[in-house]
């Protein structure tokens, strides 16, 4: 006869491990007992369980409540056992010793491999600001056994670097994603992808990029200067900019206070029916936590009675 077992049994942390040991004997042969022991190199054998043809299953005190026979029906030549709720410390070498009649004793070894799936974590880097050089966008760490694979999935251009720390029974892998921040990256997903044999599918953690910036400011509304004449209603100036975080707007008049009747509504400056009093230099001040910008325009309200129109100057300043 001969023993049938597996070289390696692989199980995920917390699952039950079936340790196979089947005696394929000739007709008339009987199995008296099957003794299971853990036999890691450098350590003495530690008894696990005894399957006895007469006495039944004995579980050694160290494994009490954790070793069972597979559910019926059972073949009397099958010495397999179930190790319940495998933990990392169970990883190692196991031996089954089968005592048969009349053929004698047989033994076989197997290795139990306990996969510890990672629980990845993603940590964003420091605040990203347009104009910075190469900056850490995020780091992703995953610890498991064996070492997990950590990669990145994104449309954003950047560079990655990885490092690994080996522990006694596992390994931690950290991958960093660096980029040169630009406003086009704002709102783009950066996804950490963790692969591991103990996972049914890759684990993904997505971080949305936020890049602080503030665009140049400009003012719209003076494109047709002939519309700015005395008596015109509904005249307005609109300040144009964009930023992250979204900017706030403030209007002032460089050569004095805002005329009465002029309404400030965020990025828009609304005028009452135009008079020559509304002529002047208006400044739009745009700011967010990252920066501030100014844009100024000169408004010259035309008198229709005069033949020649006045020039309108647009000046932008930062």
């Amino acid at each position: 006869g001969e023993l049938e077992t597996s070289d390696v049994v692989t199980v995920v942390l917390g699952q039950d491990a079936k340790l196979p040991c089947f005696y394929r004997g000739d007709s008339g042969e009987q199995v008296g007992q099957v003794a299971w022991a853990r036999v890691d190199a450098g350590e003495g054998a530690q008894e696990l369980a005894l399957l006895h043809s007469k006495y039944g299953l004995h579980v050694s005190p160290a494994y009490e409540g954790r070793v069972e026979q597979p559910p019926p029906p059972r073949n009397p030549l099958d010495g397999s056992v179930l190790l319940r709720n495998a933990v990392q410390a169970d990883e190692g070498e196991y031996e089954c010793r089968v005592s048969t009649f009349p053929a004698g004793s047989f033994q076989a070894r197997l290795r139990l491999r306990v996969l510890v799936p990672p629980l990845p974590s993603l940590n964003p880097g420091p605040a990203l600001e347009e104009g910075q050089g190469l900056t850490l966008a995020a780091s992703c760490t995953a610890e498991g056994s064996p070492a997990p694979s950590v990669t990145w999935d994104t449309e954003v251009k950047g560079t990655t670097s990885s490092r690994s720390f080996k522990h006694s029974r596992s390994a931690a892998v950290t991958s960093e994603f660096h980029l040169v921040p630009s406003r086009s990256m704002n709102g783009q997903p950066l996804t950490c992808v963790v692969s591991h044999p103990g996972l049914l599918q890759d684990q993904r953690i997505t971080h949305i990029l936020h890049v602080s910036f503030l665009a140049e400011a400009s003012v719209r509304g003076l494109e047709d200067q002939n519309l700015w004449h005395i008596g015109r209603e509904g005249a307005m100036l609109k300040c144009l900019s964009e930023g992250q975080p979204p900017p706030s707007y403030n209007w002032t008049r460089l050569d004095g206070p805002l005329p009465s009747g002029v309404r400030v509504d965020g990025d828009t400056l609304g005028f009452p029916p135009l008079t020559t009093e509304h002529s002047g230099i208006y400044v739009c001040h745009v700011s967010n936590e990252f920066s501030s910008r100014d844009s100024q325009v000169t408004v010259d309200v035309l008198d229709p009675q005069e033949d020649s129109g006045k020039q309108v100057d647009l000046v932008s300043a930062s």
């Epitope: 006895h52 006495y55 299953l57 004995h58």
Partner: antibody, heavy 126, light 107 residues
Framework: EVQLVESGGGLVQPGGSLRLSCAAS????????MSWVRQAPGKGLEWVSG????????SYADSVKGRFTISRDNSKNTLYLQMNSLRAEDTAVYYC???????????????????WGQGTLVTVSS | DIQMTQSPSSLSASVGDRVTITCRAS??????LAWYQQKPGKAPKLLIY???SLQSGVPSRFSGSGSGTDFTLTISSLQPEDFATYYC?????????FGQGTKVEIK
């Protein structure tokens, strides 16, 4: 025919020592596990100590641990029980017994006691 | 340690009676259980091992059953030489432990 004959019992004062012997014959002594079991007067049976043939593993009841030592000399087919620091509660008939040999090379379990000696009386009294 | 509880502690019966003695373990012991007979002034004698296997030379009127925690010794037809004290013993763990004994007396 399997025979187990104990000797060495007697009267001893508390704190004293005795060494019990068990001479085995009629079987291959070195292939069997052995045990000592005692029975106080009018009381039930209490397992005291055992020794495995496999690597000579020994084990003891908590009540005698640290005071009693079991050993065997396979060349003389003899089992021993060295008893030190004896107490009044150790007074009993001490039996040596052979363990049934149907568990092979597995130390975590003992087996039934299929042959017993006639016993030797140990009396601890001042 | 595993506690073994026998019942009854004593019983009176007549020759020819069917006698049943029970033994309960404080935890599961599979079939790691033996039954012994002891007569006054004599060493115990193994009757049953592995809960239900009859030891060589023991009359077939003795039988054992059970597994796990509950076990039974049955004497199908009590004979004069069967009047004795009977002990159960677990050998699942060290130390092996005995029940307190059941004394079978003549009615």
């Amino acid at each position: 025919e399997v025979q187990l004959v104990e000797s060495g019992g007697g009267l001893v004062q508390p704190g004293g020592s005795l060494r019990l012997s068990c001479a085995a014959s009629g079987y291959s002594f070195d292939t069997y596990d052995m045990s000592w079991v005692r029975q106080a007067p009018g009381k039930g049976l209490e397992w005291v100590s055992g020794i495995k043939q496999y690597k000579g593993y020994t084990s003891y009841a908590d009540s005698v641990k640290g005071r009693f030592t079991i050993s065997r000399d396979n060349s003389k087919n003899t089992l021993y029980l060295q008893m030190n620091s004896l107490r009044a509660e150790d007074t009993a008939v001490y039996y040596c017994a052979r363990e049934y040999s149907d568990v092979v090379d597995y130390v975590s379990v003992r087996t039934p006691l299929d042959y017993w000696g006639q016993g030797t009386l140990v009396t601890v009294s001042s | 340690d595993i506690q073994m509880t026998q019942s009854p502690s004593s019983l009176s019966a007549s020759v020819g009676d069917r006698v049943t003695i029970t033994c309960r373990a404080s935890q599961g012991i599979s079939s790691y259980l033996a039954w012994y007979q002891q007569k006054p002034g004599k060493a115990p004698k193994l009757l049953i091992y592995a809960a239900s296997s009859l030891q060589s030379g023991v009359p077939s009127r003795f039988s054992g059953s059970g597994s796990g925690t509950d076990f039974t010794l049955t004497i199908s037809s009590l004979q004069p030489e069967d009047f004795a004290t009977y002990y159960c013993q677990q050998h699942y763990t060290t130390p092996p432990t005995f029940g307190q004994g059941t004394k079978v007396e003549i009615k």
